[in-house]
């Protein structure tokens, strides 16, 4: 390891730090509407929160940015929460020949860390 | 695809938008200097910029949470700028038996994408 | 409580029709797809279909295309399977099983409904 | 000839470890997950393990699930006579849509 540890309770408090949280999206929202049919509205986990110093570090290069940040914050961005991983969807969608289904492995994200 | 197209032109101006940028960084920057002996400073490249909506979308996930950061700014964070590929980097570092090499696969970013 | 009900036994004769129901309860009705599948005696699962409710759209295993109609009422929370010429190798427990939240597997089923076909 | 291949049948001693394996290919268990079902004697599927490794509330930890590459598969520790019954691994498919495995009959000796 890079002698640098990652932390996983939250310094700003409960919920404040990078999470996972469900948006309820209709697919006029996301502009789907004409070409996916089913479901109608989309359950999207996806992640939020800030990412204090050394929380939820994503790997090595997280843990620098989050040390370089602190010594030059103008010139080197705070880490950010983004998806570790992502569970798949099946959506019911349009095709010239009629309806079919296909899955998408990257549209939900399943958890979150800072990177 | 999701019917939404990434672009790779920046809308708000040159050197604005997510993109990889070589930060100077010294083995104290780092809080290294009691185990990595070589090299004394490194190059660090790193991710930063601003991902307006659809530039650089690293999937699905991210093309969708720009849309919605569009109509719900305040629930949904913009995606944001980070590694979409690292390049290997070695360190030589002390050990018990003396000196070794290590090889590190997550300390440089060598691309970037917004997620 | 999550809960799907289906319709009570069949014996039938080949060349008959036949539709058998699955009702919901205890959850949104059109929020979660329904699918059919099929295990014959003494045999595996083999998945036939699925429906979403809230738009009757409709998708089929190609192994079942033009086999089977399914189709929902919506009204009144249920769902359909059906035959409109039975024959003898359409004789297996029948179940419905509501979709998990994305879609990639079932969380719920039915009590099934066993179809014989028999001259 | 189903698109998961599982083994007929196990089986195990109470109180033993046993498991239970689902093969498949890169167009189904290698692009996405696996859930397991339990079929008791006589009764409908129950949703035993889903995407991979995930456990529905009420279904004890003795029961895990695991995905490696094109295969899966349901481990079952502290084996109890309840646990006599056929399992069923489920995937997606490119080509079917939703596939399952032929179905282990797991039968728990003594």
């Known amino acids: 390891s890079a002698h640098l540890h990652p932390r996983d309770s939250c310094p700003l408090g409960p919920g404040r730090c990078c999470h996972l949280e469900t948006v309820q999206a209709t697919l006029e929202d996301l502009g789907w509407s004409d070409w996916v049919l089913s479901p109608r509205q989309l359950q999207l986990s996806m992640c939020v929160g800030e990412c204090p110093h050394l929380y939820r570090s994503a790997n090595t290069h997280a843990l620098i940015k989050a040390r370089l940040h602190g010594l030059q914050p103008d010139r080197v961005p705070a880490p950010c929460c983004v998806p570790s991983s992502y569970t798949p969807v099946v959506l019911m969608h349009r095709t010239d020949s009629g309806v079919s289904l296909q899955t998408y492995d990257d549209l939900v994200a399943q958890g979150c860390h800072c990177a | 695809s999701a019917h939404l197209h990434p672009r790779d032109s920046c809308p708000l101006g040159p050197g604005r938008c997510c993109h990889l940028e070589t930060v100077q960084a010294t083995l104290e920057d780092l809080g290294w200097s009691d185990w990595v002996l070589s090299p004394r400073q490194l190059q660090l490249s790193m991710c930063v910029g601003e991902c307006p909506h659809l530039y650089r979308s690293a999937n699905t996930h991210a093309l969708i949470k720009a849309r919605l950061h569009g109509l719900q700014p305040d629930r949904v964070p913009a995606p944001c700028c980070v590694p979409s590929s690292y390049t290997p980097v070695v360190l030589m570092h002390r050990t018990d038996s003396g000196v070794s090499l290590q090889t590190y696969d997550d300390l440089v970013a060598q691309g970037c994408h917004c997620a | 409580e999550v809960q799907l009900v289906q319709s009570g036994a069949e014996v039938k004769k080949p060349g008959e029709s036949l539709k058998i129901s699955c009702k919901g309860s205890?959850?949104?009705?059109?929020?979660?797809?329904i699918g059919w599948v099929r295990q014959m005696p003494g045999k595996g699962l083999e998945w036939m279909g699925v429906i979403d409710p809230s738009g009757s759209y409709t998708i089929y295993s190609p192994s079942f295309q033009g086999q089977v109609t399914i189709s929902a009422d919506k009204s009144i929370s249920t769902a359909y399977l059906q035959w409109s010429s039975l024959k003898a190798s359409d004789t297996a427990m029948y179940y419905c099983?509501?979709?998990?939240?994305?879609?990639?597997?079932?969380?719920?089923w039915g009590q099934g409904t066993l179809v014989t076909v028999s001259s | 000839q189903s698109v998961l291949t599982q083994p007929p049948s196990v089986s195990g001693a109470p109180g033993q470890r046993v498991t239970i394996s689902c093969s498949g290919s890169s167009s189904n268990i290698g692009v996405l997950y696996v859930n397991w079902y339990q079929q008791l004697p006589g009764t409908a599927p129950k949703l035993l393990i889903y995407s991979n490794d995930n456990r529905p509330s009420g279904v004890p930890d003795r029961f895990s699930g695991s995905k490696s590459g094109t295969s899966a598969s349901l481990a079952i520790t502290g084996l109890q006579a309840e646990d006599e019954a056929d399992y069923y691994c489920q995937s997606w498919d490119s080509s079917s849509n939703y596939v399952f495995g032929g179905g282990t009959k797991l039968t728990v000796l003594g």
């Open positions: 099983a509501r979709y998990g939240r994305y879609g990639t597997y079932f969380d719920y």
């Open positions: 205890g959850y949104s009705f059109t929020s979660y797809w």
